[in-house]
C-alpha cells in the first residue's frame, strides 16, 4: 500500500477569449490541495470557436448561441459530469469589443447580453462575460507567463523547465498582439513611474513587483492595417492602391465603407471619389516599413521617453516573452529561433515579401488566403513595432522570446485571468508543511 | 468615479474665439468618445460634434463645420472644444458629454457669453 | 436630419400621480436592433442627466418610478409616481445618426 496513489481532487476552469477575430475557449485543470501552489494549473484543451469576433455578431446576435455551441460541448465532454457545476466559466472580451463600445454601448451591451445569455444555458458555473481592460489585459499576460515560467515560485530549481528559463527569480516582460492591439508590460529597472495610468502594484507569493503596462488600442495587426490603408489611399491618385506590403501580383478590392468602419481609421477619414479601390501588391519590405513607420507618431513626447503616440515608456529591462499574434506570425515565417538575429529576420522579410503571389499561394496552398497574403505586412509590423515602436535593437532582439505555449499551455492573458478571479494567486507566500500535498499513503 | 471637470465661464467679443476645456478622471480617457453638446438660454440642446480621443479623429454637426475644432492632449486626460467667429447667438452653456452613443457622463457646463 | 418632436411642452401633474411625456422622431431611430432613444432630467443650473438608454433601459441610480418604451419612431417617458424632485425639464435625444438630435423639452411641473 505504501506506493498506493489516492485518487486526485481535481479542479477545472474554462476561460473564454472573446479576441476581435475570433473566440478560443481554454479549460484549465489543477489538483484541489495544491490551488495555491505556483505553477500548478495547467492547460488542458483550446477550442477555437468558428467564425469571428464576437463584435462582429452585433448585426446578428441571434446567431450567438450557434457559434458558441461546438466549443461549449466540448468543454462538456472534456471536464466530467460531476464536476460540472462547480466549474467558472468566464468570458473576457477584449480590443474588438472596446472598439464596438467606443462606437455604441447599447450595441456592446446587447453583444454581452445574449453571449451572457447563451454561456448560461450550459451546466457550469457560469461567472459573467465582461470587456476586460488594456491594462488587465496586459497584467494578466505578465501573470500568465512568469506564472508559467516559474517565476513566482520561490523553490530555486537545479533544472530548467523551459529551454529559455532562466534559474534567477527576475521576471520575464510580456508582449502581446492581437488584431486590435497589443500589450507591453514588464518591471522597469526604476520603480518610480512618471506616468500613473501605466503603473501597477501587486504582491503575489510574498513579493512586490511595480509593473509598467500599456495597451495600444488600434495597433494590434488587423487594425494597424485598416489605419495603414486608410493612411495610404488618401494620397492615391486613383481607385488603384500600389502597395509595398503585399506579395507582387496580388489584387484585392476594398469597399471604402468597411475601411472606415472602425474608429482606428477616424483620423484619415476623408471623402474620395469612388466606394471602393483596388489594391496592388509590389511586394517591397523597405517600402512597407516606411508606410507602417507613418502610424507611429514619435515627434510628441511629454514624458523623458516614449513609446509612440505620446505614451510613456521606461527602459526596457530584462528578457520579453513574445506571445499570440508575435508567436503566429513569426512562427508562419519560421522566424522563432533564438538563433535568429535581428538582422537576420529583417533579411528573409525582404526575400518573403518581394515572392510573387501565385508562387507564395503554391508554396502554401493549405493556408486560406486572407491569411496567407497578410503575413507580408504583418511580418514587417511586428519588427516596426518591436523596434521602433518598443525601442529594442538589433543588440536587444536576443531578449525577445517569441512563446506560443509554456509546459503546454498557451501564453495569454486567459490563465492570468482565471487565476485572480478564483483568488489562486495568493499575496503571501503558502507554508507548505512536510507531506501536506502527498498523494501517497 | 468618472469625472469631467470643464474650464470657467468666459466673456467674448464677436468675431473672436473660445477655448473651453474638458478633463476627465475615472476612467482611460482614450477609450470613449467626447461630445461637446451646447444650450442656448431658454433652447433646446444642441449637439456639436465629438473627437476620438485614442486619435484624434472627429465629427462635427455641419452647423459648425468650419467653426469648431475638437482636439485633445492624452497625457492630461482633456479635450477641448474651440468655437471662431463668434457671434451673440452663440452665447450658451457649453457641455462635455462622454460616450459613443449613451451620455451618461457630463461636464458642469462652461456658461460662454458674447457680448460687444 | 432626423427631427425629435417632444410632446407637450409642458405639463403639471399631482405629487403621487403619473406623468407621460412623448417623443416622435422624423424617421426610425433603431438600428441592429436597439433603439437609439434616450431620455435625460435637467434641472435648472445642472446638466442634463441620463434616465433611460436604448428606449428601455434605466440608467444607473435611477428610480424605479421613471420607465421607457416604445421604438422606431415613437417613445414614451412615464414617472409612474411624481415626487417634488422630478420637477425639471425631460428631453429626448436619438443617436442612430449624426448629427444627434434633441427634443424641444417638456416642462413638469406640481399640480
Known amino acids: 500500500t505504501q506506493n498506493k496513489a489516492l485518487p486526485e481532487n481535481i479542479k477545472y476552469g474554462i476561460v473564454l477569449d472573446a479576441g476581435s477575430s475570433h473566440t478560443s475557449l481554454y479549460i484549465y485543470k489543477w489538483p484541489a490541495e495544491k490551488e495555491n501552489d505556483t505553477g500548478v494549473v495547467h492547460q488542458v484543451e483550446e477550442c477555437r470557436v468558428k467564425g469571428p469576433g464576437i463584435s462582429k455578431y452585433v448585426q446578428k446576435v441571434n446567431e450567438i448561441g450557434i457559434y458558441l455551441t461546438d466549443c461549449m460541448e466540448r468543454a462538456r465532454e472534456v471536464i466530467p459530469r460531476s464536476q460540472h457545476q462547480e466549474t467558472p466559466v468566464y468570458l473576457g472580451a477584449t480590443a474588438g469589443m472596446r472598439l464596438l463600445r467606443m462606437e455604441s454601448e447599447e450595441l456592446a451591451d446587447r453583444v454581452l447580453d445574449v453571449v451572457e445569455r447563451s454561456l448560461s444555458n450550459y451546466p457550469f458555473d457560469f461567472q459573467g462575460a465582461r470587456i476586460i481592460t488594456g491594462q488587465e489585459e496586459g497584467a494578466y499576460g505578465w501573470i500568465t507567463i512568469n506564472y508559467l515560467l516559474g517565476k513566482f515560485s520561490q523553490k530555486t530549481r537545479w533544472f530548467s523547465i523551459v529551454p529559455y528559463e532562466t534559474n534567477n527569480q527576475e521576471t520575464f516582460g510580456a508582449l502581446d498582439l492581437g488584431g486590435a492591439s497589443t500589450q507591453i508590460t514588464f518591471v522597469p529597472q526604476n520603480q518610480t513611474t512618471e506616468s500613473p495610468d501605466n503603473a501597477l502594484q501587486f504582491r503575489l507569493y510574498g513579493k512586490d513587483y511595480n509593473v509598467y503596462t500599456h495597451s495600444f488600442l488600434c495597433y494590434g495587426k488587423d487594425q494597424a492595417l485598416w489605419q495603414k490603408l486608410a493612411k495610404d489611399i488618401q494620397v492615391a491618385s486613383n481607385e488603384i492602391l500600389r502597395d509595398p506590403c503585399f506579395h507582387p501580383g496580388y489584387k484585392k478590392v476594398v469597399n471604402v465603407s468597411d475601411l472606415y468602419k472602425t474608429p482606428c481609421t477616424k483620423r484619415f477619414e476623408m471623402t474620395l471619389p469612388f466606394q471602393q479601390f483596388e489594391i496592388q501588391g509590389i511586394g517591397n519590405y523597405q517600402q512597407c516599413h516606411q508606410s507602417v513607420l507613418e502610424l507611429f507618431n514619435t515627434s510628441y513626447c511629454p514624458y523623458s521617453q516614449c513609446a509612440f503616440n505620446g505614451i510613456f515608456l521606461p527602459p526596457l529591462q530584462g528578457d520579453f516573452g513574445a506571445f499570440s499574434a508575435f508567436y503566429f506570425v513569426m512562427n508562419f515565417l519560421n522566424l522563432t529561433s533564438e538563433k535568429v538575429s535581428q538582422e537576420k529576420v529583417t533579411e528573409m522579410m525582404k526575400k518573403f515579401c518581394s515572392q510573387p503571389w501565385e508562387e507564395i499561394k503554391t508554396s502554401y496552398a493549405g493556408v486560406k488566403e486572407k491569411y496567407l497574403s497578410e503575413y507580408c505586412f504583418s511580418g514587417t509590423y511586428i519588427l516596426s513595432l518591436l523596434l521602433q515602436g518598443y525601442h529594442f535593437t538589433a543588440d536587444s532582439w536576443e531578449h525577445i522570446h517569441f512563446i506560443g505555449k509554456i509546459q503546454g499551455s498557451d501564453a495569454g492573458w486567459t490563465l492570468g485571468y482565471m487565476l485572480n478571479l478564483t483568488n489562486m494567486i495568493p499575496a503571501e507566500q503558502p507554508l507548505s508543511t512536510p507531506l501536506s500535498h502527498s498523494t501517497y499513503v | 468615479q468618472v469625472q469631467l471637470v470643464q474650464s470657467g465661464a468666459e466673456v467674448k467679443k464677436p468675431g473672436a474665439s473660445v477655448k473651453v476645456s474638458c478633463k476627465a478622471s475615472?476612467?482611460?480617457?482614450?477609450?470613449?468618445?467626447m461630445h461637446w453638446v451646447r444650450q442656448a438660454p431658454g433652447q433646446r440642446l444642441e449637439w456639436m460634434g465629438y473627437?476620438?480621443?485614442?486619435?484624434?479623429?472627429?465629427t462635427f454637426n455641419q452647423k459648425f463645420k468650419g467653426r469648431v475644432t475638437i482636439t485633445r492632449d492624452t497625457s492630461a486626460s482633456t479635450a477641448y472644444m474651440e468655437l471662431s467667429s463668434l457671434r451673440s447667438e452663440d452665447t450658451a452653456v457649453y457641455y462635455c458629454?462622454?460616450?459613443?452613443?449613451?451620455?451618461?457622463?457630463w461636464g458642469q457646463g462652461t456658461l460662454v457669453t458674447v457680448s460687444s | 436630419d432626423i427631427v425629435m418632436t417632444q410632446s407637450p411642452d409642458s405639463l403639471a401633474v399631482s405629487l403621487g400621480e403619473r406623468a407621460t411625456i412623448n417623443c416622435r422622431a422624423s424617421?426610425?431611430?433603431?438600428?441592429?436592433?436597439?433603439?437609439?432613444m434616450y431620455w435625460f432630467q435637467q434641472k435648472p443650473g445642472q446638466p442634463p442627466k441620463l434616465l433611460i438608454y436604448?428606449?428601455?433601459n434605466q440608467g444607473s441610480g435611477v428610480p424605479d418610478r421613471f420607465s421607457g418604451s416604445g421604438s422606431g419612431t415613437d417613445f414614451t417617458l412615464t414617472i409612474s409616481s411624481l415626487q417634488a424632485e422630478d420637477v425639471a425639464v425631460y428631453y429626448c435625444?436619438?443617436?442612430?445618426?449624426?448629427?444627434?438630435?434633441f427634443g424641444g423639452g417638456t416642462k413638469v411641473e406640481i399640480k
Open positions: 458629454a462622454r460616450g459613443g452613443t449613451r451620455f451618461a457622463y
Open positions: 475615472g476612467y482611460t480617457f482614450t477609450d470613449y468618445n
Open positions: 473627437i476620438v480621443p485614442l486619435n484624434g479623429g472627429s
Open positions: 424617421e426610425s431611430v433603431d438600428n441592429f436592433g436597439v433603439s437609439f
Open positions: 436604448g428606449a428601455s
Open positions: 435625444q436619438q443617436t442612430k445618426e449624426v448629427p444627434y438630435t
